[in-house]
Amino acid sequence: QRFAQAQQQLPLESLGWDVAELQLNHTGPQQDPRLYWQGGPALGRSFLHGPELDKGQLRIHRDGIYMVHIQVTLAICSSTTASRHHPTTLAVGICSPASRSISLLRLSFHQGCTIASQRLTPLARGDTLCTNLTGTLLPSRNTDETFFGVQWVRP
Amino acid sequence: QRFAQAQQQLPLESLGWDVAELQLNHTGPQQDPRLYWQGGPALGRSFLHGPELDKGQLRIHRDGIYMVHIQVTLAICSSTTASRHHPTTLAVGICSPASRSISLLRLSFHQGCTIASQRLTPLARGDTLCTNLTGTLLPSRNTDETFFGVQWVRP
Amino acid sequence: QRFAQAQQQLPLESLGWDVAELQLNHTGPQQDPRLYWQGGPALGRSFLHGPELDKGQLRIHRDGIYMVHIQVTLAICSSTTASRHHPTTLAVGICSPASRSISLLRLSFHQGCTIASQRLTPLARGDTLCTNLTGTLLPSRNTDETFFGVQWVRP
């Protein structure tokens, strides 16, 4: 009983339940392959509980092991389009601080029009995650087709 | 020690660890694009701890943010079959109550024979999730090829 | 306050937060379709907290329901290569003890060069998971392209 009460009284953030699910806002300007994300209940089913957005990129607020997941669907796409524009590649990585820059997850579209994957990775407070889409095909902004999220799993 | 005892004494459900993993039972009748699911240890490695099945559709019992995941493999399929029968699309959404109806996750098969993805989404007690497979190709019922599940992540 | 203190004093392992993320070490010798994995901070972003490696295969240390995820990318691959070498298939399963041997997750590459999926499954202490890659194409050892992991979710 005491535990149940304590659990209710403690703010969720103190339990380390950081979580975010983002939807695509827009693609990058000149020579910037990054996707820019947005989140919040006013936009639909996206949210940030703990992590924050910094100019459309996701910044981590709590050290720990995270499950990172992403799905990106190309906007005008058939298997012939996808192969004609090959290579179209998506990479998720830590882009800042520069000292921790690393690619975490990489996928090519080949003859498909959607990529989806997930992985466990250690992240530290202040790490900013970037999602780079290289190639000439553009992503769909539908919230059920393109999304990006993280879930804190353990310290 | 006190915490460990308390944790053991509390039913898991009170910690909010709702989770389900389902296997395909059958496809819908004429004009019903929904897949019908089943779960339980007697069937293999599927289970429901918290959520329930309502006529083959998954109903949520606890408010919270959930990780929803799915994999569907087409039964008699090669890349040529898949492209010839295109478009074959899978959509996961809230189908009831009607006031909350929305598509959460959508994928097309294009030249592939399997789709797999996952996402974080808020769900409320009473939400029923439906998985609609549109097209003429049929899903495999092998439990390692086609499955659908949810995991409660946080309030 | 008491709960927060107790939580900090208890070793994480007692909370059941077993988790592992592995990177590819090498493929098996002749007639052995298994992939051999490695993990540890010295190797990059892979780690084992609870589960262990037994001759490159992942052994579970705690009973429970786990989220199992995998991504495998073929090393020298285009959609034409993938279709020419078809079928290339990846299967994740319990390979020992023999009495519990079962396939948990199966995917074919068809015309793609990457597969990625995840599922919830009950696992028991002592279960060893094997990942079998059948076909003539070889997997990439890049840590952002090929990885395999498990996360304890609940008892």
Epitope: G28, A75, I76 | - | -
Partner: nanobody, 129 residues
Framework: QLQLVESGGGLVQPGGSLRLSCAAS????????MAWYQQAPGKQRELVAQ???????NYADSVKGRFTISRDNAKNTVYLQMNSLKPEDTAVYYC???????????????????????WGQGTLVTVSS
């Protein structure tokens, strides 16, 4: 509905220059990207250059450093400046627009996007001495 009008094609000597224009009229606020494709005789249509609504550009390897795509938002026009032209650049050049239309659907007011490609009628570029 969007309409596209192309101009600027013609005959030019190797090493010469041309500037193609493509003017869009209609619902120009929903343009996601504009591009130029080329189709040489007996070959499939291939992307030459693309510019997104965010200003990002992409070029085919064969034209990098020679062709420049630009966009004048005030005139709703996309340009392709073609320099150092080669005989192998001879082709019909098509203007392409990726159109993103938005609708609010369903009981929760879900915003949905529909994507559509619109093509111009093509303009012939011949590079020959």
């Amino acid at each position: 509905q969007l309409q596209l009008v192309e101009s600027g094609g013609g005959l030019v000597q190797p090493g010469g220059s041309l500037r193609l224009s493509c003017a869009a009229s209609g619902n120009i606020f929903s343009i996601y990207a504009m591009a130029w494709y080329q189709q040489a005789p007996g070959k499939q249509r291939e992307l030459v250059a693309q510019i997104t609504n965010a200003g990002s550009t992409n070029y085919a390897d064969s034209v990098k450093g020679r062709f420049t795509i630009s966009r004048d938002n005030a005139k709703n026009t996309v340009y392709l400046q073609m320099n150092s032209l080669k005989p192998e650049d001879t082709a019909v050049y098509y203007c392409n627009v990726l159109h993103e239309s938005t609708e609010v659907a369903g009981p929760v007011g879900e915003k949905r996007y529909t994507y559509q490609e619109i093509w111009g009628q093509g303009t012939l570029v011949t590079v020959s001495s």
